[in-house]
């Protein structure tokens, strides 16, 4: 049973980047907390040129953006996976 369970682990990020992305070039961000089939938190950024990059959750600049998003969404109940457009 355990073997079957672990074959269903699904992380989308193979490689993570800490490279800074200016907010004006970010289209949207998807944050997937641990669980949901993946044992680690994943942050996926869509750039304005439609390319996608997985960002290291420890990168200081993405933590700032996430904090900003948290503040903006503090009035709504939390959801396990959420996408935010960057204004």
């Amino acid at each position: 049973v355990l073997e079957v369970y672990y074959t269903h682990l699904r992380c989308r990020c193979v490689q993570e980047s800490s490279v800074f992305i200016p907010r004006r070039f970010i289209d949207r961000i998807q944050i997937s907390p641990r669980g949901n089939g993946c044992p680690r938190k994943e942050i996926i950024v869509w750039k304005k040129n439609k390319s996608v990059v997985c960002v290291d959750p420890q990168a200081e600049w993405i933590q700032r953006i996430m904090e900003m998003l948290r503040k903006k969404s503090s009035s709504t109940p939390p959801v396990p996976v959420f996408k935010r457009k960057i204004p």
């Epitope: 800490s18 490279v19 800074f20 992305i21 200016p22 004006r24 070039f25 750039k47 040129n49 390319s51 990168a59 200081e60 600049w61 700032r64």
Partner: antibody, heavy 119, light 107 residues
Framework: EVQLQQSGPELVKPGASVKISCQAS????????MNWVKQSHGKRLEWIGD????????TYNQKFKDKATLTVDKSSSTAYMDLRSLTSEDSAVYYC????????????WGQGTSVTVSS | DIVMTQSHKFMSTSVGDRVSITCKAS??????VAWYQQKPGQSPKVLIY???HRHTGVPDRFTASGSGTDFTFTISSVQAEDLAVYYC?????????FGGGTKLEIK
Amino acid sequence: EVQLQQSGPELVKPGASVKISCQASGYAFSDYYMNWVKQSHGKRLEWIGDINPNNDGTTYNQKFKDKATLTVDKSSSTAYMDLRSLTSEDSAVYYCARLSWSFFAMDYWGQGTSVTVSS
Amino acid sequence: DIVMTQSHKFMSTSVGDRVSITCKASQDVSSGVAWYQQKPGQSPKVLIYSASHRHTGVPDRFTASGSGTDFTFTISSVQAEDLAVYYCQQYYNTPWTFGGGTKLEIK
């Protein structure tokens, strides 16, 4: 090989206008923002603005919004910068530079166009 | 606008020496900083992006660090061909802004 080829030096009179060109080759021109940078003889670099050739969207440094106009011609993979109402303060070398989508600094630069404003 | 200040306009060094150039931002720019090298008569060339990441093909004697407002660019063992002006640039917020440049002179 990515190359940005800029037009030649310009000697213009005060009050006149000038149009500098930057022809790109070796990459998909529409996919990358083009930046323009001024380098005065004092050597400081100043960002004038950028243009997205995909939709002609521009972002200007407020300092240059009444001085410069950025345009592109996708058919010839060429970016242009118009400078108007020229004064001696506008005498400088002007560079076009491509923005990298990988790391967002300017990864390829033209050779520069010298503009001299003198009567 | 964010002001980038390079406190030294000139730095004199000898071949083989270690040299560090500093750059201070007038407000927090996170890791949105690049370093450029401009050799005499040439266009600027990017060496470092995202405060500490070396661009492809840049020798490993060039390193950089920093976050927030204070940034440092280091050449661990200066070579004769490193004679150039070095600029920091922030790309945290538009307008992108550059430091005034530090000219590295070889004794």
